[in-house]
């Protein structure tokens, strides 16, 4: 017997559907109507035939009461080929729901997204996460998607993007966006970062994550942030192969005074990089290749320093910096 494609937990909280059959019974997903967090994995199916079965141009207000009864707060949709028109139809209907967090992963969006009709209501998401989503429209995808969202988005995460740079002139500002995560785009690099951080479109960013994004030096990142007018409080550059030295011909970059937390863990560093901010509340240099304790003049003024997992740290060694957070035990790096 084939397993049921959808499983709802006994608390009506989590519902997971895995549609792996070539012609799945989509009605099975109705058991998820009472769930708060829903995951639907479509097994790589092409959802084009759906367009024949639904009227994508129908007024979504006719579904408003039905959709309002859904408890879903967080929805994950993955592994499918989705016509843009179908995606838009879903977003229009979900605008009447309580949905706050949407994750799209391993999707291929085909065709172009139509413009938002005047009477349409945008989807009031607080969080949008995209992983390995390709768009037929190339660089304009964010601008096209953005018009279907209300301006209150707080968290935007874009991983394994096929086009991590955006068409900046088409993108509107994200006035409420406090967290931007571009991690896991190894081809991004510092030039790509400059293209992705559309100037003055991200005025409220507090947390910027750039793990595994092909960054080369903290100074190069500083320059990209300065050019975009982005002033994060927290910056994560972990899991990049960072160079400690700065290109002597590169202009010196002044970090924003707003930055108080910098993560440089798992960055392959053999010495503390040059050109760090002068003052930080938190600096994480754990799991690097530091062969000696950093000298005070090599470090910023820092309240909370983590050096765990570096070769120079032998268990029982005195802590190398006042206020440091080392456990004395080398973690599994």
């Amino acid at each position: 017997t084939t397993p049921e494609p959808c499983e709802l937990d006994d608390e009506d909280f989590r519902c997971v559907c895995n549609f792996s059959e070539p012609q799945p019974d989509w009605s099975e997903a109705f058991q998820c109507v009472s769930a708060v967090e829903v995951e639907i994995h479509a097994g790589g199916l092409n959802l084009e035939p759906f367009l024949k079965r639904v009227d994508a141009d129908a007024d979504p207000r006719q579904y408003a009461d039905t959709v309002k009864a859904l408890r879903v707060r967080r929805l994950t949709v993955g592994a499918a080929q989705v016509p843009a028109q179908l995606l838009v139809g879903a977003l229009r209907v979900l605008a009447y729901s309580r949905l706050k967090e949407l994750t799209l992963e391993d999707l291929k969006i085909t065709g172009t997204m139509p413009p938002l009709p005047l009477e349409a209501t945008g989807l009031a998401l607080s969080s949008l996460r995209l992983r390995n989503v390709s768009w037929a429209t190339g660089r304009s995808w964010l601008a096209e998607l953005q018009q279907w969202l209300k301006p209150g988005l707080k968290v935007l995460s874009i991983a394994q993007a096929h086009s991590p740079a955006f068409s900046c002139e088409q993108v509107r500002a994200f006035p409420a966006l406090t967290s931007l995560d571009l991690s896991d785009n190894p081809g991004l690099g510092e030039r790509g970062l400059m293209a992705a951080l559309c100037p003055h479109k991200f005025p409220a960013i507090q947390n910027l994550a750039l793990r595994n994004t092909g960054m080369e030096t903290p100074t190069g990142v500083c320059a990209a942030l300065a050019a975009a007018g982005v002033q994060p409080h927290s910056l994560d550059l972990s899991h990049n192969s960072l160079r400690a030295t700065v290109n002597p011909s590169a202009p010196r970059c002044m970090w924003s005074s707003a930055l108080n937390s910098l993560n440089l863990s798992f960055a392959g560093l053999e010495q503390v990089p040059k050109g760090l901010p002068a003052k930080l509340r938190v600096l994480d240099l754990s799991c690097n290749r530091l062969n000696r304790a950093p000298q005070p003049d090599e470090l910023p003024e820092v309240d909370n320093l983590t050096l765990d997992g570096n070769p120079f740290l032998v268990p029982g060694t005195a802590l190398p910096h006042e206020g440091s957070m080392n456990s004395g035990v080398v973690p599994a790096c």
């Epitope: 909280f13 989590r14 009472s34 708060v36 967090e37 859904l70 408890r71 967090e101």
Partner: antibody, heavy 115, light 111 residues
Framework: QLQLQESGPGLVKPSETLSLTCTVS?????????WNWIRQPPGKGLEWIGY???????SYNPSLKSRVTISRDTSKNQFSLKLSSVTAADTAVYYC????????WGQGTLVTVSS | EIVLTQSPATLSLSPGERATLSCRAS??????????LHWYQQKPGQAPRLLIY???NLQSGIPARFSGSGSRTDFTLTISSLEPEDVAVYYC?????????FGQGTKLEIK
């Protein structure tokens, strides 16, 4: 059998941050459900503060949202509450609770806000 | 937010009598076929204990004298034959939409 245990200081000064941790045994906080904080001022009713779900998603009571952070440490199977800028009105027994029908409760810890 | 109003505030009955506690919601707490309304018992110095979930389902380990009914906005907790150990405060709670809210409680006393 699932068990939840709150820990943290019993006395917090006004304007400071209240910090509590809930340690979960007999179940994983990252495999399912919502993991809540609920409080009860002395002699009063129950108030839901917020939750962090198995996925790391959070939801907060709008009346406290500007002051509350709920986070988790999956390696220790713990989740935590931080409530900033506390006043005497935040004096309460704080419970950690599993699910949205609250079937599993910690025994509660009294936090008094006083100088 | 959904406001839950419990009545009466205090209920005083004799052992063996039937207790009926009411909970009214300011808007429906139903989502399709389910009513996301739950009942709890709290004794002094203890954490609340779940009695009934989704309006009418008896939580494991709870005596069968407890039952629940209702849908949409009107719900009832019934204790068919009161025992002395049923002295407690009873709360209803909705989990249909956040913020998840509680009623103000009904105090059950034994004469």
């Amino acid at each position: 059998q699932l068990q939840l245990q709150e820990s943290g200081p019993g006395l917090v000064k006004p304007s400071e941050t209240l910090s509590l941790t809930c340690t979960v045994s007999g179940g994983s906080i990252s495999s399912d459900s919502a993991w809540n904080w609920i409080r009860q001022p002395p002699g009063k009713g129950l108030e839901w503060i917020g939750y962090i779900s198995y996925s790391g998603s959070t939801s907060y009571n709008p009346s406290l949202k500007s002051r509350v952070t709920i986070s988790r440490d999956t390696s220790k199977n713990q989740f935590s509450l931080k409530l900033s800028s506390v006043t005497a009105a935040d004096t309460a027994v704080y419970y950690c609770v599993r699910g949205l029908r609250f079937a599993y409760w910690g025994q509660g810890t009294l936090v008094t806000v006083s100088s | 937010e959904i406001v839950l109003t419990q009545s009466p505030a205090t209920l005083s009955l004799s052992p063996g009598e039937r207790a009926t506690l009411s909970c009214r919601a300011s808007e429906s707490v139903d989502s399709y076929v389910n009513s996301f309304l739950h009942w709890y018992q709290q004794k002094p110095g203890q954490a609340p204990r779940l009695l009934i979930y989704r309006a009418s389902n008896l939580q494991s380990g709870i005596p069968a004298r407890f039952s629940g009914s209702g849908s949409r906005t009107d719900f009832t907790l019934t204790i068919s034959s009161l025992e002395p150990e049923d002295v407690a405060v009873y709360y209803c709670q909705q989990s249909n939409e956040d913020p998840y809210t509680f009623g103000q409680g009904t105090k059950l006393e034994i004469k």
